[in-house]
Interface confidence: low
């Protein structure tokens, strides 16, 4: 007898994992055999859709590989023309193990800013997201929060926030871990210990100490009077993100030394500066005490000027007289490279004989100053133009180095050779004028260089000598 369709096994909710098989069963009793159709969310499932398999006269619907988009309400409808059509519906709940769809990435951030490490997830049930820092679960606090999206937000990033992070997505079906990422906190360069100012004696050593920190560890550069440090030795060490730089200087002139700590943040730099002055004690006062000893000149600069195996006065007020005096001459010598050919040999002779004065040995070794007449010959004849220019520069504060003050004698304070011929030293390089010998007595020289013309007498000279400083 004809029998209207009856669905004997109503559809139930089916849970299925992605990529697994899901089957709905719609058992129907009827006569004649019914036609059974299937819908998903009220849209007909086509028989030829290869993602589905419909068997047992349409009573079994199999989804061959579940996708998360298969989620929805599935209904079967049976109709055999006898009575009305019958329908039963059930839900497909696509269960999904957690999946991290937007993993976190390495982040570099400057201390004090806000950092966000992304972690977007999928899964059913919806995964909960937590974070691990290093090996431990990250605890949320006033600065740290896991957002609804799963991302980690850190306000006012601190150095201690740096480290390795990973996010963890978890639901009843499993757990997913992101790859480990690095949060690097960069810190502007900062000076922890500034160099200290020093007041020292000429020719002594000074060590300027500068300590800085920052992330990345800063580099330290030293500036001397606005230029890169040209001499001295720099010792550096780095420990625990602190760079320690020591500049050891051999002091021959006062200076302003600046320690500059620099580090780089992307394309930008941060710098910190600290400065110290090195002044020279008694710099402006002539040295009154002749403390020192006689020794053969063993330097290089004055080899061509001083007599062979000359006995010179070495001043023990310097830490290392030989090298202090050599360095003094060396620096001043370089400044003579630009003077006129007439002036240069005379100035070199004056410089070397003034810094490395002839020495009279004895119970108390005594330096023998240059005779005033020779000094005036250099000043008022050979180098008049240059001497005047130098004194003008000195008055106007234009001299780059104050070191020349120690290497230029004050002629007016030197003894005259007419007072006591043995009390002062002559400059063999400035030989007397043979046509007009009244100014200087004859002298012998193994290295004649320039004839001295007729000198104006020192008493009638209209050239005023501004006070400079003498080494002795």
């Amino acid at each position: 007898l004809p029998k209207a369709p009856v669905i004997t096994t109503p559809l139930e909710t089916v849970d299925a994992l992605v990529e697994e098989v899901a089957t709905f069963m719609c058992a129907v009793e009827s006569y004649p055999q019914p036609e059974i159709s299937w819908t998903r969310n009220k849209i007909l499932i086509k028989l030829f859709d290869t993602r589905y398999s419909i068997r047992e006269n349409g009573q079994l619907l199999t989804i061959l590989s579940v996708e998360d988009s298969d989620d929805g309400i599935y209904c079967c409808t049976a109709n055999n023309g006898v009575g009305g059509a019958v329908e039963s519906c059930g839900a497909l709940q696509v269960k999904m193990k957690p999946k991290i769809t937007r993993p976190p990435i390495n982040v570099k951030i400057i201390e004090g800013l806000k950092a966000v490490l992304p972690c977007t997830t999928m899964g059913n049930p919806k995964p909960s997201v937590s974070w691990i820092k290093g090996d431990s679960p990250l605890r949320e606090n006033s600065r740290t929060a896991v957002l609804e999206s799963g991302s980690l937000r850190i306000h006012n990033v601190q150095k201690e926030d740096a480290g390795q992070y990973r996010c963890v997505a978890k639901n009843s079906l499993g757990t997913a871990y992101s790859k480990v990422v690095k949060l690097e906190v960069e810190v502007f360069a900062r000076i922890l210990r500034a160099p200290e100012s020093h007041n020292v004696t000429f020719g002594s050593f000074v060590t300027l100490h500068c300590t800085a920190t920052g992330i990345p560890v800063p580099t330290i550069t030293w500036i001397e009077n606005g230029n890169a440090v040209s001499s001295g030795s720099i010792q550096e060490s780095v420990k625990d993100r602190v760079i320690d730089s020591r500049l050891q200087l051999f002091i021959t002139k006062p200076g302003l030394y600046t320690c500059i700590a620099t580090n780089k943040h992307g394309e930008k730099f941060s710098t910190a500066k600290a400065a110290a002055t090195v002044s020279i004690a008694e710099w402006s006062k002539p040295q009154k005490d002749n403390k020192g000893y006689c020794a053969q000149y063993r330097g290089e600069v004055c080899n061509a000027v001083l007599a062979k195996d000359a006995l010179v006065f070495l001043n023990t007020s310097y830490a290392d007289p030989e090298e202090a005096q050599e360095l003094l001459v060396h620096t001043a010598w370089n400044e003579l490279k630009v003077v006129s050919p007439l002036c240069r040999p005379a100035a070199e002779a004056l410089l070397c004989n003034h810094v490395f004065q002839e020495c009279s040995p004895g119970v108390v070794p005594t330096p023998i100053p240059i005779c005033r007449e020779y000094c005036l010959a250099v000043k008022e004849l050979f180098c008049a133009k240059e001497w005047l220019a130098m004194e003008e520069k000195t008055h106007r504060g234009l001299y780059r180095s104050e070191m020349h003050l120690l290497s230029v004698p004050e002629c007016s304070k030197l003894p005259s050779m007419h007072w006591d011929p043995t009390a002062c030293a002559r400059l063999p390089h400035l030989d007397y004028n043979k046509e007009n010998p009244k100014t200087f007595p004859p002298m012998t020289s193994s290295k004649p260089s320039v004839d001295i013309p007729n000198l104006p007498s020192s008493s009638s000279s209209s050239f005023s000598v501004s006070p400079t400083y003498s080494m002795t």
Epitope: T207, S231, Q235, F250, E300, D320, E326, L327
Partner: antibody, heavy 121, light 112 residues
């Protein structure tokens, strides 16, 4: 990389001569003072000689004065120690060392590996 | 001629603190002697540790420190490590006409 490489050591009879060389690289040689330091087998360090950056002066331990000569060729970045009238007590490993600054004396902040000089008949 | 004196040997436990001293047979060590300290392990060239009394050479751990205490220079190792077992030499700049740089006899430090 800063390197100091000594050479020229060897076996020599008493009264003989040797010339040690120290080739420098990795730093501005003519900005620094240099020294020779020696170490007799099983003994401590002994400073021998020093020279400032410009070679303008030379310094020696009293016992080697007149027999040893320190010199430098800044163009070749090489330090030398000419040793004459050698005695058995000069037997030692000779180290070349760099000063931390220009003058001849003070901290030695880099050392070579040394070259052995043996004075024996 | 003044002799630079050092303890022939000292020992320290790992993590402990030890002070090596450097004196003069006649007179006191002062800052103008610019005391320097060197470390030498067997078969190796010496290595600079401290220069000019208290400045550390580049790369030297902060556990090494230098000072002048009383009439001697001192090298202090705070928190000694096994790798600190070595010979330690001090050297003094002896300003005189002959300009000498004099090493002490060395201290053999054992880290027990």
């Amino acid at each position: 990389e800063l390197q100091l490489v000594e050479s020229g050591g060897g076996l020599v009879q008493p009264g003989g001569s040797l010339r040690l060389s120290c080739a420098a690289s990795g730093f501005t040689f003519d900005d620094y003072g240099m020294s020779w330091v020696r170490q007799a087998p099983g003994k401590g360090l002994e400073w021998v000689s020093a020279i400032p950056w410009n070679g303008g002066s030379t310094y020696y331990k009293e016992s080697v004065k007149g027999r040893f000569t320190i010199s430098r060729d800044n163009a070749k970045k090489t330090l030398y120690l000419q040793m004459n009238s050698l005695k058995s007590e000069d037997t030692a490993v000779y180290y070349c060392a760099k000063r931390s600054g220009r003058i001849a004396f003070g901290a030695l902040d880099a050392w070579g590996q040394g070259t052995l000089v043996t004075v024996s008949s | 001629q003044a002799v630079v004196t050092q303890e022939p040997s000292l020992s320290v436990s790992p993590g402990g603190t030890v002070t090596l001293t450097c004196g003069l047979s006649s007179g006191s060590v002062t800052a103008s002697n610019y005391p320097d300290w060197y470390q030498q392990t067997p078969g190796q060239a010496p290595r600079g540790l401290i220069y000019s009394t208290d400045s550390r050479h580049s790369g030297v751990p902060s556990r090494f420190s230098g000072s002048i205490s009383g009439n001697k220079a001192a090298l202090t190792i705070t928190g000694a490590q096994p790798e600190d077992e070595a010979d330690y030499y001090c050297a003094l700049y002896m300003y005189s006409d002959s300009k000498l740089y004099v090493f002490g006899g060395g201290t053999k430090l054992t880290v027990l």
